[in-house]
């Protein structure tokens, strides 16, 4: 049975050229986190695997860092990065558990006088 | 052109353990992850794990977490081990090793060059 | 664990003719998944990778499609040195799963 659950950093804003932590935590269960995969739309970004370590996708390498813990941070963004983010966190025994962030990407000015989505 | 040679055909019995090699030529050793499969007589492939020779990192199917074992000789640089004990009759099967096709990475990694394969029997 | 059932367990076709076969994951694994082929005795042997991408020296009849949960191996006019089994699998989450394999063999 999944007893577990995503907390998330929900819908969040950031600047254009400014960068981002994406975070997510598995809470309520004591299932053995294996793999998270972080993935936007249908894109795989990043695999953390607990025995191995990260994987970055060649495509996003100078863009994405990896961490802080199993979250990651997105650099140099642009409005192209606005979107749907998931975290995929492969468990044992438990299965598959899956967040959703939205980010929003702003232009500078618009940034500065308010964001639609503030961070937790 | 790359080559996976694996060692010979093993009999065992029930709570020994086996070590299979398998040595590797053709290309950077250190730069390919390697896998290893198994296929019990009659039945389709099973992963049972992955070993990065150029760190020793290795990450094992839950089934056989415990029992398996993976290592790479240090000194030559050419060859990778996989030890399963604690065996029992289950355990007959075909052991393959298998390259990971992308350098320096575990993904996307798809099983480019396959040895030959190594039959281990536990009567 | 990501589970890949594979159907039909045994597909019987002459030769010449067509062969489909089929590939479901337990759930998505986008188009991260690879084809094999293994004969009697021998070692599987690479065919397509990233679900349609055929490896260095596969012929063209072997064709590969789908994306995310259903995948189909295409070969377009056995030859009789396409009678073989024939494994998909997944490679973005550990542990790397198989399917129980598809066997073609002749009519």
């Known amino acids: 049975m999944m007893t577990g659950t995503i907390e998330t950093t929900g819908n969040i804003s950031a600047e254009k050229g400014g960068s981002i932590i994406l975070q997510c935590h598995l809470s309520s269960t004591t299932a053995q986190v294996t793999q998270v995969n972080w993935e936007q739309q249908d894109q795989l970004l990043a695999i953390c695997n607990a025995d191995l370590g990260w994987h970055i996708s060649p495509s996003f390498k100078d863009r994405v860092a990896p961490g802080p813990g199993l979250g990651l941070t997105l650099q140099s963004l642009t409005v192209n990065d606005t979107g749907e983010y998931f975290c995929i966190y492969h468990t044992y025994p438990d299965g598959t558990y899956t967040g959703r962030i939205f980010l929003e990407v702003l232009e500078s000015s618009v940034a500065e006088h308010g964001a639609r989505f503030q961070i937790p | 052109q790359v080559q996976l040679v694996q060692s010979g055909a093993e009999v065992k019995k029930p709570g020994a353990s086996v070590k299979v090699s398998c040595k590797a030529s053709?290309?950077?050793?250190?730069?390919?992850?390697m896998g290893w499969v198994r296929q019990a007589p009659g039945q389709g492939l099973e992963w049972m794990g992955v070993?990065?020779?150029?760190?020793?990192?290795?990450?094992y199917a839950q089934k056989f977490q415990g029992r398996v074992t993976m290592t790479r000789d240090t000194s030559t640089l050419s060859t990778v081990y996989m030890e399963l004990s604690s065996l029992r009759s289950e355990d007959t099967a075909v052991y393959y090793c298998?390259?990971?096709?992308?350098?320096?990475?575990?993904?996307?990694?798809?099983?480019?060059?396959w040895g030959q394969g190594t039959m281990v029997t536990v009567s | 664990e990501i589970v890949m059932t594979q159907s039909p367990a045994t597909l019987s076709v002459s030769p010449g003719e067509r062969a489909t076969l089929s590939c479901r994951a337990s759930?998505?694994?986008?188009?991260?998944l690879a084809w094999y082929q293994q004969k009697p005795g021998q070692a599987p042997r690479h065919l397509i990778y990233?679900?349609?991408t055929r490896a260095t020296g596969i012929p063209a009849r072997f064709s590969g499609s789908g994306s995310g949960t259903e995948f189909t191996l295409t070969i377009s006019s056995l030859q009789s040195e396409d009678f073989a089994v024939y494994y998909c699998?997944?490679?973005?989450?550990?542990?790397?799963?198989f399917g129980g394999g598809t066997k073609v063999e002749i009519k």
């Open positions: 298998a390259r990971l096709h992308v350098s320096g990475s575990y993904y996307p990694a798809y099983l480019d060059y």
């Open positions: 053709g290309y950077t050793f250190t730069s390919h992850y």
């Open positions: 070993i990065n020779p150029s760190m020793g990192a290795t990450s």
């Open positions: 759930q998505s694994v986008s188009s991260n």
């Open positions: 990233g679900a349609s």
């Open positions: 699998q997944q490679y973005i989450v550990f542990p790397w799963t």
